[in-house]
Interface confidence: low
């Protein structure tokens, strides 16, 4: 399981007249459910239950976004509509270029994502936990426009980073 280097850029326009970018670097792991590839896109937060909806007319986004899903404690969803892997597949079917799972509340999901699938997704499926997950969800919960850049190596030079 390789380390996924995730750079999240929160991007907003302030009334004072400046674009403000906040960059947060965090690490996760590429799971065996997906490919070990770089990916980049606008973050779309998805509720785990939102991925249950089978109506393809709903919750469709333009291609190229990064889905972020905070998994609930298993006790809160004893009979999930889809496995974690199924949720990742559903997100990719809807146009996600990558999926990031916060597994802090559901560490069992790590094993589910790493069970060697015969047909892994062609897009990266990353999981984060602990402090990295807290940082990620803190940004996502701001409901601002944000981008995630996922790499399978650390950014090579400072110029690859957005300014803090």
């Amino acid at each position: 399981k390789e380390t996924a280097f995730v750079e999240v850029v929160l991007f907003e326009s302030s009334p004072s007249g400046d674009y403000t970018t906040y960059t947060t670097g965090l690490t996760g792991r590429f799971s065996r459910a997906g490919a070990t590839l770089s990916a980049e896109g606008e973050i779309v937060q998805m509720h785990p239950l939102g991925l249950c909806n089978n109506n393809d007319e709903e919750d469709l986004y333009e291609y190229g976004w990064v889905g972020v899903v905070k998994l609930e404690q298993p006790e809160l969803d004893p009979k999930p509509c889809l496995t974690v892997l199924g949720k990742a597949k559903r997100a990719v079917q809807r146009g996600a270029t990558a999926v990031i799972f916060d597994v802090s509340e559901n560490p069992e999901a790590i094993d589910q994502l790493n069970q060697g699938s015969e047909d892994p997704l062609k897009r990266p499926v990353v999981y984060v936990k602990g402090a990295d997950a807290i940082k990620l969800m803190n940004i996502v919960n701001k409901q601002k426009v944000a981008r995630a850049r996922i790499q399978h190596r650390p950014p090579r030079q400072p110029t690859e980073y957005f300014d803090m």
């Epitope: 991007f11 326009s13 009334p15 674009y19 980049e40 606008e42 409901q143 426009v145 957005f162």
Partner: antibody
Framework: QVQLVQSGAEVKKPGASVKVSCKAS????????MHWVRQAPGQGLEWMGI????????SYAQKFQGRVTMTRDTSTSTVYMELSSLRSEDTAVYYC??????????WGQGTLVTVSS | DIQMTQSPSSLSASVGDRVTITCRAS??????LAWYQQKPGKAPKLLIY???SLQRGVPSRFSGSGSGTDFTLTISSLQPEDFATYYC?????????FGGGTKVEIK
């Protein structure tokens, strides 16, 4: 598909105001800030400002501060740009354009505003 | 304000030529740079964002590179529909600013 449809051409006298509308469809209106960019005849592109449809916050270019007002109506997914104290050099095509993390990915068809006495 | 200087201001080229347009920012803008194509009487069209990312639906003959202050738009093999004016634009800080444009004409 994403569409930004602007109001029709306007002819105004110097000193008057003009209000251009831009109706968005095909995406979640609140999720994407909207820019206004203008282009004088035969000239380049000039950024005027941006509005965040979610909260209504705005950011204007210094050049237009005090003369431009950008508003939005979330019930109709429409943004508005009003420019006051018009002068002949404000004659231009005015575009609304959707922001997607720094780039402007969709543009309206443009509204020609002519300022002439 | 960040000044964006584009060069050349115009160029003549033939179908099949490789065309390169450069854009220089007056200060570092990381990769907050986009390239647009505009044809007479039409709205600009996004080609490249984040300096090097190709917008969906744009032909792969268009490519962008650069970071910091110096950026390049390359058209690998010019097609008849590519004759237009091209603009770079920074979104690192407000006010957003555009380059003066490069008009690509038929030789």
């Amino acid at each position: 598909q994403v569409q930004l449809v602007q109001s029709g051409a306007e002819v105004k006298k110097p000193g008057a105001s003009v209000k251009v509308s831009c109706k968005a469809s095909g995406y979640t209106f609140r999720r994407y800030p909207m820019h206004w960019v203008r282009q004088a005849p035969g000239q380049g592109l000039e950024w005027m400002g941006i509005i965040n449809p979610s909260g209504g916050s705005t950011s204007y270019a210094q050049k237009f501060q005090g003369r431009v007002t950008m508003t939005r109506d979330t019930s109709t997914s429409t943004v508005y740009m009003e420019l006051s104290s018009l002068r002949s050099e404000d004659t231009a095509v005015y575009y609304c354009a959707r922001d997607k993390v720094g780039a402007i990915d969709y543009w309206g068809q443009g509204t020609l505003v002519t300022v002439s006495s | 304000d960040i000044q964006m200087t584009q060069s050349p201001s115009s160029l003549s080229a033939s179908v099949g030529d490789r065309v390169t347009i450069t854009c220089r920012a007056s200060q570092g803008i990381s990769n907050y740079l986009a390239w647009y194509q505009q044809k007479p009487g039409k709205a600009p069209k996004l080609l490249i964002y984040a300096a090097s990312s190709l917008q969906r639906g744009v032909p792969s003959r268009f490519s962008g590179s650069g970071s910091g202050t110096d950026f390049t738009l390359t058209i690998s093999s010019l097609q008849p529909e590519d004759f237009a004016t091209y603009y770079c634009q920074q979104s690192y800080s407000t006010p957003l600013t555009f380059g003066g444009g490069t008009k690509v004409e038929i030789k």
